[in-house]
Interface confidence: low
């Protein structure tokens, strides 16, 4: 601390005192001096460093008329607000002439109840998992002890006996409240009563039990509720989108997804009203009174294919001499999937039908057999997708080209010289 | 996996009866049609006969259309091949083939195959 | 009945050399033509459909290629392991009907 150059009197005749206390405490420091002539600036000092933020006060007050006379200086140094960082030796220190003088030390001290650095936090946790809680307190004066409680109850025998900083929680089946008491030779704080809430276990092994077309059926095993009961699940489903994607640890999909409530048990619920052939993310939280689960990951799923809902559309089948031209339209009825082909069947009154494959052409060119004196020739067209055949059209009779209808030059497609099968089948 | 297993093959004279079986495991039986096709000694292959996912429809290759029956039983997973009246023109190895989702007369998986001797 | 023709019933090749083994059909089958691979003591295994699309696991130096009537298979960049009976088949009609077999093999 810097010091008078020469063992004059010190002109201060007032120092700083002591203060010892709790935190959150108010107090004052003071320093008074006395000098004849020009009153001086009074700075404080902590641990020998000057405060240049100091909230002080300094009063000046003349002890005669004239300007030489004697004057009295008080400084305040005022603390609010008492903190750990507040306290150290205090002393005030003028410049006078060419020296420079310093007060006897004051000590401020902080000392009472322990303070808590860190409390323990309101959370959510799953039924029976572990989790960590946190308590730190501080004197001084030193040492503190800590004791942790669990509904009231205390969690070990005495303070310092059990968990200290970190209490480790094997995992709960109700909702509890824990807290910490810290204990010094002051006395003991308690903390805060932090709630922990017991919420089902996410649900494990969500998958697909059965699929349709416009259905998916899905179950879950649930996870374990503590004692609250499970109330219900909740399902989401979103439509994949192959340019986005859903990531396992998405937390939101990328769009509204459809929810739907499922009673339990049984833990298996039927979406219905789902597009055929489309790929979906589907997941499940399960809910208590105390609250829902965490969702499980997004899980892919996918519809299944579906048949056409109906028959190709406007079938003409045209006969020119031992030829036939068919051709015909996409069913205007969904698809439910890719459309893989057509399926054309043929008959004769006499003769037994014959189905092609015609793949995706819309129209085909029959070569009939003999002289072309087969009589009542019918022919149906079905679209099929991979999932199989749609709705069969309807018996379309062959009827005579007429001069000046347009019939198109097609590859032919010879008919198989002895044919004798059943109505078509897939 | 799929998997197809044919059984009942075997030695028999001239207008005897033989019953195949095919044994069909991972996948949706019943969505698929199934077909018997049979290797000569030659390695020619010949298509036998058809039947739909449902069993509702079948086709035949004329020569065999009246001896022959082709059936499934979709709750056993089990395609059958019912020989009746059997030509020593009929000796081969009989395979039982899935049809293709994407083609139902495209077969994407066979059988190893059951050998059927007819001899007198 | 629609005939598939093969006309080589054997093709002789070297290991990494490109072959090509063709199948014509009696009739116009829409690219109906599936193409199988038979190796000895093995049942065969569908290689194409549709005349170009490949089957699921199928080397992609396996290419189908054609329409009409004449169709063909080639394998490109021959392994020792390509070496094998190749057939055509119509999947156009009943009766479905198979060529008579091209078998592969070294020169």
């Known amino acids: 601390a810097p010091r008078g150059t020469q063992a004059e009197e010190s002109p201060f005749v007032g120092n700083p005192g002591n203060i010892t206390g709790a935190r959150g405490l108010t107090g004052t420091l003071r320093c008074q001096l006395q000098v004849q002539g020009e009153p001086p600036e009074v700075h404080w000092l902590r641990d020998g460093q000057i405060l240049e933020l100091a909230d002080s006060t300094q009063t000046q007050v003349p002890l005669g008329e004239d300007e030489q006379d004697d004057w009295i200086v008080v400084s305040q140094l005022r603390i609010t607000s008492l903190q750990l960082s507040d306290t150290g030796q205090y002393q005030c220190l003028v410049f006078l002439g060419h020296q420079t003088f310093v007060s006897q030390p004051g000590y401020v001290g902080l000392e009472g109840l322990p303070y808590f650095l860190e409390e323990p936090e309101d959370r959510t946790v799953a039924a029976n998992t572990p989790f960590n809680l946190s308590c730190q307190a501080q004197g001084p004066p030193e040492p503190v002890d800590l004791l942790w409680l669990q509904d009231a109850v205390p969690l070990a025998t005495a303070p310092g006996h059990g968990p200290q900083r970190s209490l480790h929680v094997p995992g709960l089946n109700k909702t509890s409240s824990f807290s910490c008491e810290a204990h010094n030779a002051k006395g003991v704080t308690t903390s805060r009563t932090a709630t922990i809430t017991v919420l089902p276990q996410q649900p494990r092994n969500l998958h697909l039990v059965s699929r349709q077309p416009t259905e998916l059926e899905v179950a879950w095993t649930p996870g374990l509720s503590g004692i609250y009961p499970l109330t219900h699940c909740t399902l989401q489903a979103v439509l994949s989108d192959d340019g986005m994607g859903i990531q396992a640890g998405e937390p939101d999909p990328p769009e509204e997804p459809l929810t739907s409530q499922a009673s339990v048990p049984p833990h298996q619920l039927r979406l219905g009203s789902l597009h055929p052939h489309t790929p979906y993310h589907i997941r499940v939280a399960c809910t208590s009174s105390q609250g829902p689960s965490s969702w499980t990951h997004w899980l892919p799923v996918e519809t299944p294919e579906g048949v056409p809902l109906g028959p190709p559309e406007n079938i003409s089948a045209t006969r020119n001499g031992s030829q036939a031209f068919v051709h015909w339209q996409e069913p205007r009825a969904p698809l439910q999937g890719t459309l893989l082909g057509y399926r054309l069947a043929y008959q004769g009154q006499d003769t037994p039908e014959v189905l092609m494959d015609i793949g995706l052409r819309q129209e085909v060119t029959l070569e009939l057999q003999g002289d072309g004196s087969v009589s009542n020739l019918t022919v149906c067209v079905a679209a099929y997708t991979a999932a199989g055949d749609g709705p069969w059209s309807l018996p379309v009779p062959l009827e005579a080209w007429r001069p000046g209808q347009a019939q198109p030059v097609h590859q032919l497609v010879k008919e198989p010289s002895t044919p004798a099968f059943s109505w078509p089948w897939w | 996996e799929v998997n197809l297993v044919e059984s009942g093959g075997g030695v028999v004279k001239p207008g005897a009866s033989l019953k195949l079986s095919c044994e069909a495991s991972?996948?949706?039986?019943?969505?698929?049609?199934m077909s018997w096709v049979r290797q000569t000694s030659d390695k020619r292959l010949e298509w036998v006969a058809s039947?739909?996912?449902?069993?509702?429809?079948?086709y035949y290759l004329d020569n065999v259309k009246g001896r022959f029956i082709i059936s499934r039983e979709n709750a056993k997973n089990t395609l059958y091949l019912q020989m009746s009246s059997l030509k020593s023109e009929d000796t081969a190895l009989f395979y039982c083939?899935?049809?293709?989702?994407?083609?139902?007369?495209?077969?994407?998986?066979w059988g190893q195959g059951s050998s059927v001797t007819v001899s007198s | 009945v629609i005939v598939m023709t093969q006309s080589h019933k054997f093709m002789s090749t070297s290991v990494g050399d490109r072959v090509s083994i063709t199948c014509k059909a009696s009739?116009?089958?829409?690219?109906?033509v599936a193409w199988y691979q038979q190796k000895p003591g093995q049942s065969p295994k569908l290689l194409i459909y549709?005349?170009?699309t490949r089957h699921t696991g199928v080397p992609d130096r396996f290419t189908g290629s054609g329409s009409g009537t004449d169709y063909s298979l080639t394998i490109s960049n021959v392994q020792t392991e390509d070496l094998a009976f190749y057939y055509c088949?119509?999947?156009?009609?009943?009766?479905?009907?198979f060529g008579a077999g091209t078998k592969l093999e070294l020169k």
């Open positions: 083939a899935r049809g293709a989702r994407a083609s139902y007369f495209a077969m994407d998986y």
């Open positions: 991972g996948f949706t039986f019943s969505n698929y049609g």
């Open positions: 039947i739909s996912g449902g069993g509702g429809r079948t």
């Open positions: 009739q116009d089958v829409t690219t109906a």
């Open positions: 549709w005349a170009s």
């Open positions: 088949q119509q999947h156009f009609t009943t009766p479905l009907t």
